[in-house]
């Protein structure tokens, strides 16, 4: 399998924002990329988010995702917006090489990400 | 040494406000109990509270200290507030059995207590 | 490491006066800890008799009434047990214990059996 | 007095099998409850203290758990050398008192 590197922790801003950057170990020079991201929490996993990129190109996310993303050589930047105190879990970066043939396989061991809801401000009278 | 239990993570309310338990298993019934609140960060430790109580009382912390708690039996609940993204690091549990003889020590293994600067609200003009 | 011994006679007559020694070795009983008397009967039921403290302080347990005294002799290192007017209920294994206060007992003795009979 | 009420009275467990024994206390006693193994012609041995954790030495196939009136110790798999009497004991309040014992043996 290959190896997917990525943060243990990171902490979502207060407006309910988390980046971290996931590293993986390519055996060559893929064209086609698939970065998927599953959350983990109380034993259920969820994707989160996925995209398709050729290299050297922008990642391409859904225009609905939460999550955003740039790469640069074996290194993906994701960024995901809109997390609640409820979101706080284990995020998982699943690579896939999907062209040329043969298709790898690398997921990383997840980033914890903490969210903690923000207190609302007082109303301005 | 006596060992003491204390979660692994906790995060602090948007207010900068974080509780945790920390429990010690008691050789029996001390009458004098002394608890300490040790910070490690960058391999800098430094003690950020403490309190001598006596068994069934109220902890004691100093008027200006930044922490406040409650016991019961061999768990002491540990408030810290007025905490700002800065001070993120690990916070140790040190438990010291005053009387009766002979004295006991136990530490922890430290709460990892992340903090989060909330966002400014907006002016109201 | 800590170890206590009991030592006393192995015989006592109904009425008498069943008196018992614990030697603590590895630790001066003046420094800390409290100091105990256990007993266990033939069915095997554990029974604590009661505790001298460090200081010389002292709690028995009340189901012995009156019977019981416990004492101490730091230049010996040594706690003692009496207990009086004994009846062949008083049969037992005789434990001296160490605990902390109000506490779970980490050190024994090895027993001594005493057995009250004519 | 608190009167610490065990069961079963005895237990007969096969090698490798896991073996649970009960502590009712007549009142609440917090987490202030030890567990000794007793062999013959040898003093209790402490195992477990505060409910729940091991005495220095003790194996971790032996865990207690409970907390108020209801206590468990539990022997993951039975090993030959865990044959015995097994005793609970609170020490919240004076006087300080034990469980009648369990006699464990092989099945």
């Known amino acids: 399998a290959m190896h997917v590197a990525q943060p243990a922790v990171v902490l979502a801003s207060s407006r309910g924002i988390a980046s971290f950057v996931c590293e993986y170990a390519s055996p060559g020079k893929a064209t086609e990329v698939r970065v998927t991201v599953l959350r983990q929490a109380d034993s259920q996993v969820t994707e989160v988010c996925a995209a398709t990129y050729m290299m050297g190109n922008e990642l391409t996310f859904l225009d609905d995702s939460i999550c955003t993303g740039t790469s640069s050589g074996n290194q993906v930047n994701l960024t995901i917006q809109g997390l609640r105190a409820m979101d706080t879990g284990l995020y998982i970066c699943k690579v896939e090489l999907m062209y040329p043939p043969p298709y790898y396989l690398g997921i990383g061991n997840g980033t914890q990400i903490y969210v903690i809801d923000p207190e609302p401000c007082p109303d301005s009278d | 040494a006596m060992h003491v239990a204390q979660p692994a993570v906790v995060l602090a309310s948007s207010r900068g406000i974080a509780s945790f338990v920390c429990e010690y298993a008691s050789p029996g019934k001390a009458t004098e109990v002394r608890v300490t609140v040790l910070r490690q960060a960058d391999s800098q430790v430094t003690e950020v509270c403490a309190a001598t109580y006596m068994m069934g009382n109220e902890l004691t912390f100093l008027d200006d200290s930044i922490c406040t708690g409650t016991s019961s039996g061999n768990q002491v609940n540990l408030t810290i507030q007025g905490l700002r993204a800065m001070d993120t690091g690990l916070y140790i549990c040190k438990v010291e059995l005053m009387y009766p003889p002979p004295y006991y020590l136990g530490i922890g293994n430290g709460t990892q207590i992340y903090v989060i600067d909330p966002e400014p609200c907006p002016d109201s003009d | 490491q800590v170890q206590l011994q009991e030592s006393g006679p192995g015989l006592v007559k109904p009425s008498q006066t069943l008196s018992l020694t614990c030697a603590v070795s590895?630790?001066?009983?003046?420094?800390?800890?409290?100091w105990n008397w256990i007993r266990q009967f033939p069915g095997k039921g554990l029974e604590w008799m009661g505790y001298?403290?460090?200081?010389?302080?002292?709690y028995y347990n009340p189901s012995l009434k009156n019977r019981v005294t416990m004492s101490v002799d730091t230049s010996k290192n040594q706690f003692s047990l009496k207990l009086s007017s004994v009846t062949a209920v008083d049969t037992a294994v005789y434990y001296c214990?160490?605990?902390?206060?109000?506490?779970?007992?980490?050190?024994w003795g090895q027993g001594t059996t005493v057995t009250v009979s004519s | 007095d608190i009167v610490m009420t065990q069961s079963p009275d005895s237990l007969a467990v096969s090698l490798g099998e896991r073996a649970t024994i009960n502590c009712k206390a007549s009142q609440n006693v917090g987490t202030y409850v030890a567990w000794y193994q007793q062999k013959p012609g040898q003093p209790p041995k402490p195992l477990i203290y505060s409910t729940s954790y091991r005495y220095s030495g003790v194996p971790d196939r032996f865990s207690g758990s409970g907390s108020g009136t209801d206590f468990t110790l539990t022997i993951s798999s039975l090993q030959a050398e865990d044959v015995a009497v097994y005793f609970c004991h609170q020490y919240d309040t004076y006087p300080l008192t034990f469980g009648a014992g369990t006699k464990l043996e092989l099945k």
């Open positions: 590895g630790y001066s009983i003046s420094s800390g800890y409290y």
């Open positions: 001298i403290g460090y200081d010389g302080s002292n």
């Open positions: 214990a160490r605990n902390y206060y109000s506490g779970y007992f980490d050190s």
